[in-house]
């Protein structure tokens, strides 16, 4: 058993059927030694009384708020969860897989530049009794510091027959450099409460690793004289990293025509612009990608060839 | 990344290309083992990310653009940066700074060619004969070094009497090339910086 | 932060019914149990009904086989239903929600109350 907050105690069972449990015992916070009755999740049922309280904690059943009391007066609460392992792995059934990169990927992390700002979501299908706590470092043993903010609910989608909630926090690295060499990961560790259900999530990366840009801006077409060529030209996205000339991106920029099976062409550059030919109905797109360090293109940026 | 690369000019900044080459056999380099060590913990997760060059070369802050001489997060070990020209340039006058910062590109690539061949030795010994280092890659080393033009000592190959635990030596070559590829990107960046300065 | 709203109350005959509802709206993370509580004029607050995280209820003697207590947790909504009310039953109730927000540590939120009065 560990606290994870203030009154609030982990009990870490494995999770098998008859499975001995863990014994608790609970201790009054009060200077009070006689007349203490213990109850559970505001119930009338008095457990035991005393300063202490023993319990052996098998199933959720046997989690909750446990109050002491005196004459009708409240001492003191603790609250239990459940921590399961079951066959030596512990339970994930709070966060859904999303198999992105890989299997068992429960947290997606990713940053639009070098600035050692970055946002993680996770994805669930449990719409209430739910509460999650953000915490992250580079490095886990000498850790030098990360801020998380609060996590929050950032969208709701319907998958079949399910509603699936999405939910991301935003950290940023105390004190970052963008042209540092990283040598220790960031790690990120969330924690996530159901109902009275206690499970702990884990990613760890390089922010190059986890760059993604922001899409092009300001993309434009330019026709030229006398031909079906247009010049297309867009500009860094305003949250990449400066200077570009050090920090620079290369582009993809792509002619798809209406129909998704039409061939695309590509042409990769690294200047903000580049010549090619518009068919009629088909569209232009440019997305970016670190130039140097091949992590996620961004989203495409697009404009219509008419 | 196999994309089309366009050829620089001939009056570029002449180390960009090489610079840019490196980046592009180092990749190449680090593919290629880690294909062929697929058994070995050779993905950036599962190596120790060690720096060869930690406390004797400074080239990420002694070659850090201007404009994050500002930012203090970049400073905490020196408090300088580069100023533009420098001796890739022709014939420009290279200031201190620029000098402090090819010549600590320069010693980089000098540290990592000594280790690249010494490991490279050991390699051929190994009787699986399962990896060497691409002689592309260590030539592209060769060629950046010798256009940054700096005259330095020499360094001694390693040599080791001990029989080589070839298991060890391709972990190590993992560590080296992952290590190097991060290197070669600051490198790229500041070959970049210094070409549009 | 957490919001509760009853409504339901109202003047009823003995004999009669009534249904309670308490919204509970705002950040309520992960709810460990609500309960419903009453306070009659010039009494002691006391327990009516409650309900843990696991939908278990558990009445006060008084009320068994008369009142039930449920909770939609889709709508973040506590009832309770009220039968056979008698004279006894008149007080304000009060909606009751306990819960862990994993951000602030564990809280207690109260309604401001329903009045429920039972009078021929």
């Known amino acids: 058993i560990w606290e994870l907050k203030k009154d609030v105690y982990v009990v870490e069972l494995d999770w098998y059927p008859d499975a001995p449990g863990e014994m608790v015992v609970l201790t009054c916070d009060t200077p009070e030694e006689d007349g203490i009755t213990w109850t559970l999740d505001q119930s009338s049922e008095v457990l035991g009384s005393g300063k202490t309280l023993t319990i052996q904690v098998k199933e959720f059943g046997d989690a909750g708020q446990y109050t002491c009391h005196k004459g009708g007066e409240v001492l003191s609460h603790s609250l239990l969860l459940l921590h399961k392992k079951e066959d030596g792995i512990w339970s994930t059934d709070i966060l859904k897989d999303q198999k992105e990169p890989k299997n068992k990927t429960f947290l997606r992390c990713e940053a639009k530049n070098y600035s050692g700002r970055f946002t993680c979501w996770w994805l669930t299908t449990i719409s209430t009794d739910l509460t999650f706590s953000v915490k992250s470092s580079r490095g886990s043993s000498d850790p030098q510091g990360v801020t998380c903010g609060a996590a929050t609910l950032s969208a709701e989608r319907v998958r079949g027959d399910n509603k699936e909630y999405e939910y991301s926090v935003e950290c940023q690295e105390d004190s970052a450099c963008p042209a540092a060499e990283e040598s220790l990961p960031i790690e990120v560790m969330v924690d996530a409460v159901h109902k009275l259900k206690y499970e702990n999530y884990t990613s760890s990366f390089f922010i190059r690793d986890i760059i993604k840009p922001d899409p092009p801006k300001n993309l434009q077409l330019k026709p030229l004289k006398n031909s079906r060529q247009v010049e297309v030209s867009w500009e860094y996205p305003d949250t990449w990293s400066t200077p570009h000339s050090y920090f620079s991106l290369t582009f993809c920029v792509q002619v798809q025509g209406k129909s998704k099976r039409e061939k695309k062409d590509r042409v990769f550059t690294d200047k903000t612009s580049a010549t090619v030919i518009c068919r009629k109905n088909a569209s232009i797109s440019v997305r970016a990608q670190d130039r140097y360090y091949s992590s996620s293109w961004s989203e495409w940026a697009s404009v219509p060839c008419s | 990344r196999n994309l089309p690369v366009a050829t620089p000019d001939p009056g570029m900044f002449p180390c960009l290309h090489h610079s840019q080459n490196l980046l592009r056999a180092v990749s190449n380099m680090l593919q290629k083992a880690r294909q062929t060590l697929e058994f070995y913990p050779c993905t950036s997760e599962e190596i120790d990310h060690e720096d060869i060059t930690k406390d004797k070369t400074s080239t990420v802050e002694a070659c850090l653009p201007l404009e994050l001489t500002k930012n203090e997060s970049c400073l905490n070990s020196r408090e300088t940066s580069f100023i533009t020209n420098g001796s890739c340039l022709a014939s420009r006058k290279t200031s201190f700074m620029m000098a402090l910062c090819l010549s600590s590109i320069y010693e980089d690539l000098k540290m990592y060619q000594v280790e690249f061949k010494t490991m490279n030795a050991k390699l051929l010994m190994d009787p699986k004969r399962q990896i060497f280092l691409d002689q592309n890659m260590l030539a592209v080393i060769d060629e950046l070094m010798q256009a940054l033009n700096f005259n330095s000592e020499t360094v001694p190959q390693k040599s080791s009497l001990e029989e080589p635990d070839f298991y060890k030596t391709k972990i190590k070559l993992c560590i080296l090339l992952h290590a190097f590829r991060i290197r070669a990107v600051t490198i790229d960046r500041v070959m970049s910086y210094l070409n549009a300065s | 932060q957490v919001q509760l709203v009853e409504s339901g109350g109202g003047l009823v005959q003995p004999g009669g019914s009534l249904r309670l509802s308490c919204v509970a709206s705002?950040?309520?993370?992960?709810?460990?149990?609500m309960a419903w509580y009453r306070q009659a004029p010039g009494k002691q607050r006391e327990l009516v009904a409650s309900i843990n995280s696991g939908g278990r209820p558990n009445y006060q003697e008084s009320v068994k086989g008369r009142f039930t207590i449920s909770r939609d947790n889709a709508e973040n909504t506590l009832y309770l239903q009220m039968n056979s009310l008698s004279p006894e039953d008149t007080a304000v109730y009060l909606c009751?929600?306990?819960?862990?927000?994993?951000?602030?540590?564990?809280?207690?939120?109260w309604g401001q109350g329903t009045q429920v009065t039972v009078s021929s």
């Open positions: 705002g950040s309520t993370g992960s709810i460990t149990s």
């Open positions: 009751n929600l306990r819960g862990l927000r994993l951000d602030t540590g564990l809280y207690e939120s």
